[in-house]
Interface confidence: medium
């Protein structure tokens, strides 16, 4: 039961990291109160959102002014990768802590008080007590 929910949590974390990477690769849209989606910009002349990709062919279209450049790749990927790695480390830490705690709690029922202070690979019990 617990293992299943942890697996689900890990899957969500990986998915979140992947989405963060995708968003950062897509580049940054110029700020403003625009109703336009990422990679498009408002055309005052045409009164609608236009795809920024068309600015390569027609760079002097009015809406091209609102098309932002994507930041340089190393900086763009640094934070999602770092954040994902830290999150993964945190979840793995929680997972291993939980497994040790479960194992020690099970052993607690069957061991003598002398063994509780000293070992069998369960320092957590001694620390708690």
């Amino acid at each position: 039961m617990a293992r299943g929910s942890l697996r689900r949590l890990l899957r969500l974390l990986v998915l979140g990291l992947w989405l963060a990477l995708l968003r950062s690769v897509a580049g940054e849209q110029a700020p403003g109160t625009a109703p336009c989606s990422r990679g498009s910009s408002w055309s005052a002349d045409l009164d609608k959102c236009m795809d920024c990709a068309s600015c390569r062919a027609r760079p002097h279209s009015d809406f091209c002014l609102g098309c932002a450049a994507a930041p340089p790749a190393p900086f763009r990927l640094l934070w999602p990768i770092l954040g994902g790695a830290l999150s993964l480390t945190f979840v793995l830490g929680l997972l291993s802590g939980f497994l040790v705690w479960r194992r020690c709690r099970r052993r607690e029922k069957f061991t003598t008080p002398i063994e509780e202070t000293g070992g069998e690979g369960c320092p957590a019990v001694a620390l708690i007590q």
């Epitope: 110029a30 700020p31 600015c55 390569r56 760079p59 002097h60 091209c64 609102g66 932002a68």
Partner: antibody, heavy 120, light 108 residues
Amino acid sequence: QVQLVQSGGGLVKPGGSLRLSCAASGFTFTSYAMSWVRQAPGKGLEWVSAISGSGGSTYYADSVKGRFTISRDNPKNTLYLQMNSLRAEDTAVYYCARVRANYYYGMDVWGQGTLVTVSS
Amino acid sequence: LTQPHSVSESPGKTVTISCTRSSGSIASNYVQWYQQRPGSAPTTVIYEDTQRPSGVPDRFSGSIDTSSNSASLRISGLKPEDEADYYCQSYASGSLIVFGGGTKLTVL
């Protein structure tokens, strides 16, 4: 904090050239279009030129077209205005400004201004 | 974009500065208003017709009137520090960014 610091103004003879610089800090430079606006002594504001965040799209007022070139160095967070074939009527305080260009074309951050005097 | 050359009013009173668009509808593109004190760079007091940047007092307000095809900047409770030049600005097809001629506000 968000800041635009200008440099490069001065006295130049008619027909001469000058390059203005505008160093940006405190914001993601590549995400914003940038613009140059000038103000002749005792006159109003006049838009001169604008450039998209990528630098791929440039725009000019008719009065400077073919003489002025706007550019940007995104890794250096710097905006430039190369002014050639300068005339007496180009004498003005030149301001660089950050443009909120997606959905409305307004300037929300301005440089301190730099005086360009064209005189023989 | 046409603005009155100058306006004047006493402290504590309300003043309205107009900005009339000669071609095209005033409502088709957003209007911004800038304040410029002598010897200083302009600062935004109104953007997107009616929006006020943080730090700008609520004595400043912007509006659009389609019947007169003009935008207006209203300053209530006038203070001596409001004395400055005010410029409206909008988008214009072809010239991209266009400014009004400016209005000198004198607080008597």
